[in-house]
């Protein structure tokens, strides 16, 4: 399963269909980003590939989602980590893995954690290893708010469109 | 907690109340399916039992959800796995558990992974063992798209209405 | 990451901005609750702090969310557990961790599990340990229904606004 995605041409075809609306609904801001698989030691979000999209005002700037209009949003993210046999050398101590969605707002000058998931894995005891983390919740956000992520364990990410993603939609 | 659900009669009562609408909202396509607990070595989705439902155009065909109208949908699924080590042989090799939501579309003739979660468990190391996987995200889907799941580790599923489920709703 | 939240004054500032609406949307019932970090051996949900809120009819009574109007709701919850084994005695028996969202309805006089996640951890084998559980799904709910949670492993909860939460919103 890891690393399975669309071929570039198929992905392009997928993106070329016109913006699709539900007949009975006005558009609402929504975004779904995927981790860039070409960047192995960082987590860079991409919106112009595979199943990723930005709709109705959402934009991606400095690796952060910019909230287009005030309201309640459901915000979510997933990461999958993996590791191989013999990757730790002279330690049996665990590896700390964490993923957090953070809010930076004009209202207070620091990053506020909105969603946090954490795990200790023991590479020396269990190899190979794989671990998935997902979280999502509803938050009151203000126009101009910035949503970003912080990850501990980036070198261990399994970067594919279906395993590492970050998104939000207005309710 | 595993396996706890409604008695058949209570579940039936629960389903008999008329379709409920929010006064201030038009209906939108939504579905919530649960894994059939009577099928131990396969994962068959059911919509006509317990808290499961299909609404406003969603249908279930060939174990896949059929997307009733083009638009953005939030798609989600959960599985819970459990096991007990049956022999010392189990100690040496890990068990690969994975759950994936896949899209089959007229646009390209293969299954595209939308959501993937994965885990290695070491039955000989930790017995009994239990593991939960959840994921969900927003996707642009087209009328007629088919949403299905693929699971590695089906014999280890804890099949109850609250532990193994699959759903989607239009935004 | 664990335990990181807003200072009380910043949190208060955050709550004081007027209720924010999406220009193109009517308000819909929504709630996001966080676990009270001052209560170490119980899980008490709070709505009047940090990023938590109750909107458009949702209320919190007896540690349960009261559904304000009939319809389909997306219901979600997360917990993070942590621990450290202090003695070799911990090696022999696993710790059962579980988190469940339950429904209590006038339609049948018992708690129905809606969402369940479970995990066995082996403290003596792997210390320190950290584990996150998340789940969410769409359910047809009736006005007056009560949504509550049940957790096994409460003393091990990492109680912070971004790690332990419970919410719902109308679709």
């Amino acid at each position: 399963l890891p690393g399975v995605g669309l071929t570039p041409s198929a992905a392009q075809t997928a993106r070329q269909h016109p913006k699709m609306h539900l007949a009975h609904s006005t558009l609402k801001p929504a975004a779904h980003l995927i981790g860039d698989p070409s960047k192995q030691n960082s987590l860079l979000w991409r919106a112009n590939t595979d199943r990723a999209f930005l709709q109705d005002g959402f934009s991606l700037s400095n690796n952060s989602l910019l909230v287009p209009t005030s309201g309640i949003y459901f915000v979510y993210s997933q990461v999958v980590f993996s590791g191989k046999a013999y990757s730790p050398k002279a330690t049996s101590s665990p590896l700390y893995l964490a993923h957090e969605v953070q809010l930076f707002s004009s209202q207070y000058p620091f990053h506020v954690p909105l969603l946090s998931s954490q795990k200790m894995v023991y590479p020396g005891l269990q190899e190979p290893w794989l671990h998935s983390m997902y979280h999502g919740a509803a938050f009151q956000l203000t126009q101009g708010d910035q949503l970003s992520t912080h990850t501990d364990g980036i070198p261990h990410l399994v970067l594919s469109p279906s395993t590492v993603f970050f998104g939000a939609f207005a309710l | 907690l595993p396996g706890v659900g409604l008695t058949p009669s209570a579940a039936q009562t629960a389903r008999q109340h008329p379709k409920m609408h929010l006064a201030h909202s038009t209906l939108k396509p939504a579905a919530h399916l649960i894994g059939d607990p009577s099928k131990q070595n396969s994962l068959l989705w059911r919509a006509n039992t317990d808290r499961a439902f299909l609404q406003d155009g969603f249908s279930l065909s060939n174990n896949s959800l059929l997307v009733p109208t083009s638009g953005i949908y939030f798609v989600y699924s959960q599985v819970v796995f459990s096991g007990k080590a049956y022999s010392p042989k189990a100690t040496s090799s890990p068990l690969y558990l994975a759950h994936e939501v896949q899209l089959f579309s007229s646009q390209y003739p293969f299954h595209v992974p939308l959501l993937s979660s994965q885990k290695m468990v070491y039955p000989g190391l930790q017995e009994p063992w239990l593991h939960s996987m959840y994921h969900g995200a927003a996707f642009q889907l087209t009328q007629g798209d088919q949403l299905s799941t693929h699971t590695d580790g089906i014999p280890h599923l804890v099949l109850s209405p609250s532990t193994v489920f699959f759903g989607a709703f239009a935004l | 990451l664990p335990g990181v939240g807003l200072t009380p004054s910043a949190a208060q500032t955050a709550r004081q901005h007027p209720k924010m609406h999406l220009a193109h949307s009517t308000l819909k019932p929504a709630a996001h609750l966080i676990g009270d970090p001052s209560k170490q051996n119980s899980l008490l949900w709070r709505a009047n702090t940090d990023r938590a809120f109750l909107q458009d009819g949702f209320s919190l009574s007896n540690n349960s969310l009261l559904v304000p109007t009939s319809g389909i709701y997306f219901v979600y919850s997360q917990v993070v557990f942590s621990g450290k084994a202090y003695s070799p005695k911990a090696t022999s028996s696993p710790l059962y961790l579980a988190h469940e969202v339950q429904l209590f309805s006038s339609q049948y006089p018992f708690h129905v599990p809606l969402l369940s996640s479970q995990k066995m951890v082996y403290p003596g084998l792997q210390e320190p340990w950290l584990h996150s559980m998340y789940h969410g799904a769409a359910f047809q709910l009736t006005q007056g229904d009560q949504l509550s949670t049940h957790t096994d492993g409460i003393p091990h909860l990492v109680l912070s606004p971004s790690t332990v939460f419970f919410g719902a919103f109308a679709l």
Epitope: K89, G124, L125, G153 | - | -
Partner: antibody, heavy 114, light 113 residues
Amino acid sequence: EVQLVESGGGLVQPGGSLRLSCAASGYTFSSYWIEWVRQAPGKGLEWVGEISPGSGSTNYNEEFKGRATFSADNSKNTAYLQMNSLRAEDTAVYYCADGYHGAWGQGTLVTVSS
Amino acid sequence: DIQMTQSPSSLSASVGDRVTITCKSSQSLLYSTNQKNFLAWYQQKPGKAPKLLIYWASTRDSGVPSRFSGSGSGTDFTLTISSLQPEDFATYYCQQYYSYPRTFGQGTKVEIK
């Protein structure tokens, strides 16, 4: 390449305190434990303890509990060892190490003397 | 605590000699589930930091010459230098990372004969 650089050593009076720093580079710091090991002049290696910078979890050698405190600043990729109530027998070269990658710093000498 | 005992404490050898250092632990360092021994060997030269040579009892670290090898399981371990070179004169330490606190052997000093 993983690199660890210690600093902060020097001459301290008995009963005094010292904070040693271990600056890491060449890898993502927060997920991997930093261990502290010391070596008295002409003696062997002694494990003081370790910290997980991301989680803040620590493991101490009982012999140092109460006198040694580990901390970390993830934004600076730096781990710290605070030693209190120092005595002459704490005179040693203090090393930080990352066992996951098998890397050690060059060490910093702490001399406790009046 | 697990006690680590190295022998000999020191030895004299010539360039080209085969050198063997042993390390005994007071309890097994073998983790039965994955059949790995939680033991490392370090080399230390005067005024320098220890350098990792071997981990998991027998895995050579990258860049370590093939003349260094580790063997053994459970409580008895050996570091072998198949043909001693001038740059190998140093002190060698074994370390267990099976349990807390991590502990080292007292060291074996390899000197020029």
